[in-house]
Amino acid sequence: LCQGSNYSTCASCPSCPDRWMKYGNHCYYFSVEEKDWNSSLEFCLARDSHLLVITDNQEMSLLQVFLSEAFCWIGLRNNSGWRWEDGSPLNFSRISSNSFVQTCGAINKNGLQASSCEVPLHWVCKKCPFADQALF
């Protein structure tokens, strides 16, 4: 259904799996439990999804409505510069960071924040509805 889509778009699909929220043309999963960044990534990948890659300010603002003060892991890392898991640079928003050792990105209702990757946090997965191959 969503095959052939690029990293930022999915075809319009009718529904999302159980416990996933449909927003626009994507499905989002907001975790109840907490994991470190790597375990969060693995969780998402095992469900044919990926840690949240935010494409623009509009998507970010819409998602922040569903967030609280608690931080959630997203698909953002500092590897010689802040980059999303799809390889694109972070260029539409700033991330609060001034520590060399805090190299993973999280989000809450107030914005993006760097953290040590091993901190257990909630996380957000993103996928195309019922897609097997179009991950971002």
Partner: antibody, heavy 125, light 112 residues
């Protein structure tokens, strides 16, 4: 640019209370994952961790000194305070504050990336 | 408490030498999250401590690659290639894996 600077009385007498201030800039102690710890260095001896405080006001103390230590913060002034009660000559040392990083355990920390210049404290009668 | 034993306590070197400092912990310092929070700091006279290595082998920002950390479990090593005058001082290992965080006694790197 992260800067920390300690200030204290310099000299005090046994049984008095030592009050230290760590003034910092370049980051906020309201930011998730940030903390400030106090470490001292008695001349000719090893570094010794004393206490630290996190962005969420969680605190931890050196168990051997816990009954004498109090750490607190004023985030509006970007300051952290340490009080050491009933000082003795053994408390003579250079006292440092350092920024610490949270990794999921409030009782400990890692990566003291930034340190103050230190303030010398002498306890003498 | 985790006791960190550094050897040697004094290390006389000639400029250009390689220096090796050992830090042995009284118990395994792998944290339950799988990371080992073993660090190395350098304290020079009249200065504040500087972070060199974190999580056993990761060089901190701006630290030259002449400094390298290695080890696992209870045995850790800091190596300094081609010692220069500016490398002299006291090297401390530190563990933040277990409560309370603790420092080693320090190794003084000095000229022969």
């Amino acid at each position: 640019q992260v800067i920390l600077k300690e200030s204290g009385p310099g000299i005090l007498q046994p049984s008095q209370t030592l009050s230290l201030t760590c003034s910092f800039s370049g980051f906020s102690l309201t930011t998730f994952g940030m903390g400030i710890g106090w470490i001292r260095h008695p001349s000719g001896k090893a570094l010794e961790w004393l206490a630290h405080i996190w962005w969420n006001d969680d605190k931890s103390y050196n168990s051997a000194l816990k009954s004498r230590l109090t750490i607190s913060k004023d985030t509006s002034k970007n300051q952290v305070f340490l009080r050491l009660a009933n000082v003795a000559t053994a408390d003579t040392a250079t006292y440092y504050c350092a920024r610490t990083i949270y990794y999921g355990n409030y009782l400990t920390f890692y990566a003291m990336e930034h340190w103050g210049q230190g303030t010398s404290v002498t306890v003498s009668s | 408490d985790v006791l960190l034993t550094q050897t040697p306590l004094s290390l006389p070197v000639s400029l250009g030498d390689q220096a090796s400092i050992s830090c042995r912990s009284s118990q395994n310092i792998v944290h339950s999250n799988g990371n080992t929070y073993l660090e190395w700091y350098l304290l020079k006279p009249g200065q504040s401590p500087k972070l060199l290595i974190f999580k056993v082998s990761n060089r901190f920002s701006g630290v030259p690659d002449k400094f390298s950390g290695s080890g696992s479990g209870t045995d850790f090593t800091l190596k300094i290639r081609r010692v220069e005058a500016e490398d002299l001082g006291i090297y401390y290992c530190f563990q933040g894996s277990h409560v309370p965080p603790t420092f080693g006694a320090g190794t003084k790197l000095e000229l022969k």
